[in-house]
Amino acid sequence: ESGYAQNGDLEDAELDDYSFSCYSQLEVNGSQHSLTCAFEDPDVNTTNLEFEICGALVEVKCLSFRKLQEIYFIETKKFLLIGKSNICVKVGGKSLTCKKIDLTTIVKPEAPFDLSVIYREGANDFVVTFNTSHLQKKYVKVLMHDVAYRQEKDENKWMHVNLSSTKLTLLQRNLQPEAMYEIKVRSIPDHYFKGFWSEWSPSYYFRTPEINNSPGEMDP
């Protein structure tokens, strides 16, 4: 799906200090979905502020969020997942600000896990594998993954590889010999659903072997 090519960045000018953002997670707990919202400004006094979602719900008109420290949270099976919902910040039953949001466009996948790297001596390469809970899901099954790796000493020189599978091969000749590498992976929805990058997986660390030229062998 092409989605919308961006042309400028004209967000609605908020008339108040209650600008907020939300993300959804589908089938995050069995068949239950979740919706998490938080104020953009961490200094907003959230005392007496409530969040409510109305529209595009099954069997009910509106649902109220639970407050957990500075975030607002719903876990439910009642998202219709088609059409726009109206999410409002309220105080004493009065709406302060609202946003119309299609929950299928703000999906944040769960972070990948079980990242590992195995060196294959005969092939002179490294096989990177990881797992994702989304392989078992019924809605957000198709993801694009971003594998990022760097030499540990190069703090900001991350190399990125995008892939749709959970396996990647890195050629030894493209890495520095006898070096420690850090690698991590994150995911984003890639078919119909839209949204945000997941959190990064925990990093995995691996060392590359020294270059070992046998007698008579030429350098690649």
Epitope: Y4, E11, D12, G83, Y192
Partner: antibody, heavy 118, light 111 residues
Framework: QVQLVQSGAEVKKPGASVKVSCKAS????????LHWVKQAPGQGLEWIGG????????AYNQKFKGKVTLTSDRSTSTVYMELSSLRSEDTAVYYC???????????WGQGTTVTVSS | DIVLTQSPASLAVSPGQRATITCRTS??????????MHWYQQKPGQPPKLLIY???NLESGVPARFSGSGSGTDFTLTINPVEAEDTANYYC?????????FGGGTKVEIK
Amino acid sequence: QVQLVQSGAEVKKPGASVKVSCKASGYRFTDYELHWVKQAPGQGLEWIGGIDPKTGGTAYNQKFKGKVTLTSDRSTSTVYMELSSLRSEDTAVYYCARSGGRWYFDVWGQGTTVTVSS
Amino acid sequence: DIVLTQSPASLAVSPGQRATITCRTSESVSIHLLHLMHWYQQKPGQPPKLLIYGASNLESGVPARFSGSGSGTDFTLTINPVEAEDTANYYCQQSIKDPYTFGGGTKVEIK
């Protein structure tokens, strides 16, 4: 009430361009994407493309890329569809439609007839 | 592009009877329980009007005699009982994949 009001009928010569407008009222303009749908005489419906008034972002049916340009003006809650290099095949009724969700159309304009004739 | 095939092309029904229109897609337009199929009614000289979204959800203000069902590649719009004012063309539309395509239409006439 929620309304989309389109500009009036146009008669154009082949090779010319035409710009059709669609003015939204009765709801917050930036809350919903607006799309355009073509209906040639006696024919079915064909999605042309859509625009997100909040960002100005556009999505086009590949078939209409290069033929159609979609724009929006938040100050007047109006979206525009410009058709260029007109040919007889462009003769049709063009509808603007609000997207209530991804991507079905819950409110429609009354339609604008564009006739291309030499 | 996803092709939507409607049948029948035309249909004549007596008032009080049931009218059934089917729409078959060239590939699935469902993601689990999310069915990205919608139905419209168009009367002569008027714009289309949304009847059903998400295969089975009745749009606000649409009479309950209209209903939709189906999943995957096979969907149905049912009008029961048909009334004289239901004379119109009916279109299905998918929204799982750009370009969002419509069926060729079914003309419903009341006998």
